[in-house]
């Protein structure tokens, strides 16, 4: 059995050359004619040069999952899906996402160091002594209160709350 | 003797249309499977487009659908249909036998898309 | 598609000279690789076919060789109607079937 060069197919004990991206085999080839190719339908794509009988199906980007298309299927390229706004991708297979989540909410006692994008989760960071923040969407953790002197400290504040003062 | 000969060729305005024939004579012209391919002034062959017997059609993607070719086997006669021509189609365009290599030339027709 | 890079882009030789064209292909055609001669202001003419086989009527100082990527067209002696521009051409995987540049093979 003979071993194929890198862009060439096996067929029975021949070796033909494969088709371009775009097209898939419609004839192998023979002693006198090459490999005779076919464009893509519609709604199907090859990316790479193949030896493939029928193009492969494009992806479909599913709503319920958090995709929406970000780039339309063309015959030599599957679609490309996105996250929806808000949401990141979990599983990447090369430029193709397959599901998303929804981006994590900084719990409280946490700021947001880097807003989520479409691929990556939102970042948190803990807040520094003597700041607080309720978490969320907060980008900055907030100082605690200075209780005034016509004020007590009833509770020091903490990471996740500020400061409670009474009035005397 | 195998005998292609295109005709059709001639000054178009950007935008127009010409119609390419090419009259075979010498062979069974139903039997073989016909090309176009062309050759723009001073530059290498270009593929244009092949017709297989029964009439199914393969295109130069380049060409982005602009061209179509046909064939009339009661008259022995390979046509290319020409719409929207620019001027990077002004070539010498020869009709030639086979689908994949090409065993018989006609001398050409030259085309030039000028205004 | 495929892109044929031929070289050189001239050689310069004289009559009786041994003549070596190279065709090479961005990825294989196999076997499927033909050579046509085209003198000014004429069609081009078929020589070789899958890559090493003459057509009717070319002369046996044509000669062409290689697989895959690399083929080589040898013109072993060269007669005065053999100075001309050449041209190979893939038909492995198609359409489109694509042509090199040319090489022009001019008197020294």
């Known amino acids: 059995q003979p071993s194929c060069r890198q862009e060439e197919f096996l067929v029975g004990d021949e070796c033909c050359p494969m088709c371009n991206p775009g097209y898939h085999v419609k004839q192998v080839c023979s002693e006198h004619t090459g490999t005779v190719c076919a464009p893509c339908p519609p709604q199907t794509y090859t990316a790479h040069a193949n030896g493939l009988s029928k193009c492969l199906p494009c992806g479909v980007c599913d709503p319920d999952m958090g995709l929406l298309t970000w780039q339309e299927c063309s015959s030599w390229k599957d679609t490309v899906c996105r996250c929806i706004p808000g949401y990141f991708c979990e599983n990447q297979d090369g430029s193709h996402c397959s599901t998303c989540l929804q981006h994590t909410t900084c719990p409280p006692g946490q700021r947001v160091e880097k807003r989520g994008t479409h691929d990556q989760d939102t970042v948190c960071a803990d807040c520094l002594t003597g700041t607080f923040s309720l978490g969320g969407t907060q980008e900055e953790c907030l100082p605690w209160t200075n209780c005034s002197a016509f004020q007590q400290e009833v509770r020091r504040g903490t990471n996740s709350t500020d400061t409670t003062c009474s009035s005397q | 003797e195998v005998q292609l000969l295109e005709s059709g060729g001639g000054l178009v305005q950007p935008g127009g249309s010409l119609r390419l024939s090419c009259a075979a004579s010498g062979f069974t012209f139903s039997s073989y499977a016909m090309s176009w391919v062309r050759q723009a002034p001073g530059k290498g062959l270009e593929w244009v487009s092949e017709?297989?017997?029964?009439?199914?059609?393969n295109y130069n993607p380049s060409l982005k659908s602009r061209f179509t070719i046909s064939r009339d086997n009661s008259k022995n006669t390979l046509y290319l249909q020409m719409n929207s021509l620019r001027a990077e189609d002004t070539a010498v365009y020869y009709c030639?036998?086979?689908?994949?290599?090409?065993?018989?030339w006609g001398q050409g027709t030259l085309v030039t898309v000028s205004s | 598609e495929i892109v044929l890079t031929q070289s050189p882009g001239t050689l310069s030789l004289s009559p009786g000279e041994r003549a070596t064209l190279s065709c090479r292909a961005s990825r294989s055609v196999g076997k499927y690789l033909a050579w046509y001669q085209q003198k000014p202001g004429q069609a081009p003419r078929l020589l070789i076919y899958?890559?090493?086989t003459r057509a009717t009527g070319i002369p046996d100082r044509f000669s062409g060789s290689g697989s895959g990527t690399d083929f080589t067209l040898t013109i072993s002696r060269l007669e005065p109607e053999d100075f001309a521009v050449y041209y190979c051409?893939?038909?492995?995987?198609?359409?489109?079937?694509?042509f090199g540049q040319g090489t022009k093979v001019e008197i020294k």
């Open positions: 017709i297989s017997q029964s009439g199914s059609s």
């Open positions: 899958g890559a090493s």
């Open positions: 030639a036998t086979g689908r994949w290599r090409f065993d018989y």
């Open positions: 051409q893939q038909y492995g995987s198609s359409p489109p079937v694509t």
